[in-house]
Amino acid sequence: SQVSQNCHNGSYEISVLMMGNSAFAEPLKNLEDAVNEGLEIVRGRLQNAGLNVTVNATFMYSDGLIHNSGDCRSSTCEGLDLLRKISNAQRMGCVLIGPSCTYSTFQMYLDTELSYPMISAGSFGLSCDYKETLTRLMSPARKLMYFLVNFWKTNDLPFKTYSWSTSYVYKNGTETEDCFWYLNALEASVSYFSHELGFKVVLRQDKEFQDILMDHNRKSNVIIMCGGPEFLYKLKGDRAVAEDIVIILVDLFNDQYFEDNVTAPDYMKNVLVLTLSPGNSLLNSSFSRNLSPTKRDFALAYLNGILLFGHMLKIFLENGENITTPKFAHAFRNLTFEGYDGPVTLDDWGDVDSTMVLLYTSVDTKKYKVLLTYDTHVNKTYPVDMSPTFTWKNSKLPNDITGRGPQ
């Protein structure tokens, strides 16, 4: 049913869903801090623009009695329960921030007449693509897929002269929420990635993965997995790896690779790490002081969600337009706004664009070095290191199929 919105007469409210089931195991207090820091910035920006209005957030907490797994597995109904709670209390704001789980976002979008914008820090899955009033502020699976297909096809770089058309995907079911949906997208038979590859097999057991590393009859030299270096080590250990194996480790929300004192362990030498370009340092901000590097992106997405709302509110108020309209609900896309850590660009479907960075381990320095970057907004590759000190023969990435001739 249509819920009246606290969104007029100079008072604008943001409904923040504080769900027990979350894409990242982040204390809700940290997310509250991020939201409150965002509110302070928004109020300042509106005041500087001469807009004398009130902006507040209402935090809606789940009772946690039924949905208590803490991860996203039991999140499907939690979002709807919270919406029902909002509806009963007549406390809907101008915008809904949350949920972060793909299951709950999909279900909420499906089961409600959304005449208000929904901003999510997460909702990584393909099922949340192309939703007209949904904005996602963390890189969704679709963006990852487009990078991988682009990189697989590339054969005109001095360090990658073979097009690839095959891959193994390691997916054992214990992944974090982001990894689960990234790998799910690669596994899906109808996805762009599957469509563009000639051969793709999902490895579900540790032993399957371990066997492939030295299997002379393997069908691909390339293995995609998702997680951090420690995750890889648990799986791979110090096992020998054939010289033409390439492991692509997707670890988007981890900026530890860029820290000055980090040395790459030896088991990372056959690995290319795909991560996001680190923003300016968030270490001094009050909301991120207690966060691990992997959690910063999540809290930052909540904060940027507030700043995005402030950006849109400012535009609509300056143009004298109504906030409680479908036009406002559909406006949170195809734009760039000033985020906490610099400009944030949203694509035509409201999904955040970013610079992905592909790293390799230098055999000379044992440091992670940038091989190339990829701008998801224009789907363009920017080579960085034209003569990388690879572990692979001739400082070139190998062919994806052993024994296949030059291309």
């Epitope: 770089l157 001095p158 360090f159 920017y382 080579p383 960085v384 290191d385 034209m386 030059p406």
Partner: antibody
């Protein structure tokens, strides 16, 4: 319209050093690698090296490793190449060249003429 | 490093004539790149990835080839096409250029 504006001609004595500048405008300087290319009088082109302004990554042609030093100043969108221990063999026109992958060497500066003579 | 050999070193063509410049690589490359240079000017990107024309280049020009053998073709020579053309590879590091082909108008 983007531009690569190189510093003017140089006449230097053997054994000296010289620093050539290349100021970029009209595009995002840090997004594109900057190459340097040598063209000796009436001869072909030789690639010296490349630098990524954002990450500071430098790759040299082995032939020029002890001759050239590449640097950038992000704040002024300027790339520099220093050439040391100059001899008459280093007399040439030097170009800075932007990369716009997949179109390598897509835009060239106007060139800086270096003459090494006593 | 890969050596690129261009032929001929110098040639002349009449207006309207078809012109082909060849570039042979000492080992196989995936793509070839071509540059045009006129006296007193900087080189200009002309053809990239074997057959893609750079911005502003006339459709009279085309590029083709594979492996070790590549060529640049002008379907109908015009006076403004008189220049030196260089081929270049970036398949192997370091990138290398051919010796150039000087094309004159008759």
């Amino acid at each position: 319209e983007f531009q690569l504006q190189q510093s003017g001609p140089e006449l230097v004595k053997p054994g000296a050093s010289v620093k050539i500048s290349c100021k970029a405008s009209g595009y995002s300087f840090t997004d594109h690698n900057m190459n340097w290319v040598k063209q000796s009088n009436g001869k072909s082109l030789e690639w010296i090296g490349v630098m990524n302004p954002k990450f500071g990554t430098i790759n040299y042609n082995q032939k020029f490793k002890d001759k050239a030093t590449l640097t950038v100043d992000q704040s002024s969108s300027t790339a520099y190449m220093q050439l040391n221990s100059l001899t008459s063999e280093d007399s040439a026109v030097y170009y800075c060249v932007r990369d716009d992958y997949p179109n390598y060497f897509d835009y060239w500066g106007q060139g800086t003429t270096l003459t090494v003579s006593s | 490093q890969i050596v690129l050999t261009q032929s001929p070193a110098i040639m002349s063509a009449s207006p309207g004539e078809k012109v082909t410049i060849s570039c042979s690589a000492s080992s196989s490359v995936n793509y070839m790149y071509w540059y045009q240079q006129k006296p007193g000017s900087s080189p200009k990107s002309w053809i990239y990835r074997t057959s893609n024309l750079a911005s502003g280049v006339s459709a009279r020009f085309s590029g083709s080839g594979s492996g070790t053998s590549y060529s640049l073709t002008i379907s109908s020579m015009e006076a403004e096409d008189a220049a030196t053309y260089y081929c270049q590879q970036y398949h192997d590091y370091p990138p290398t250029f051919g010796g150039g082909t000087k094309l004159e108008i008759k």
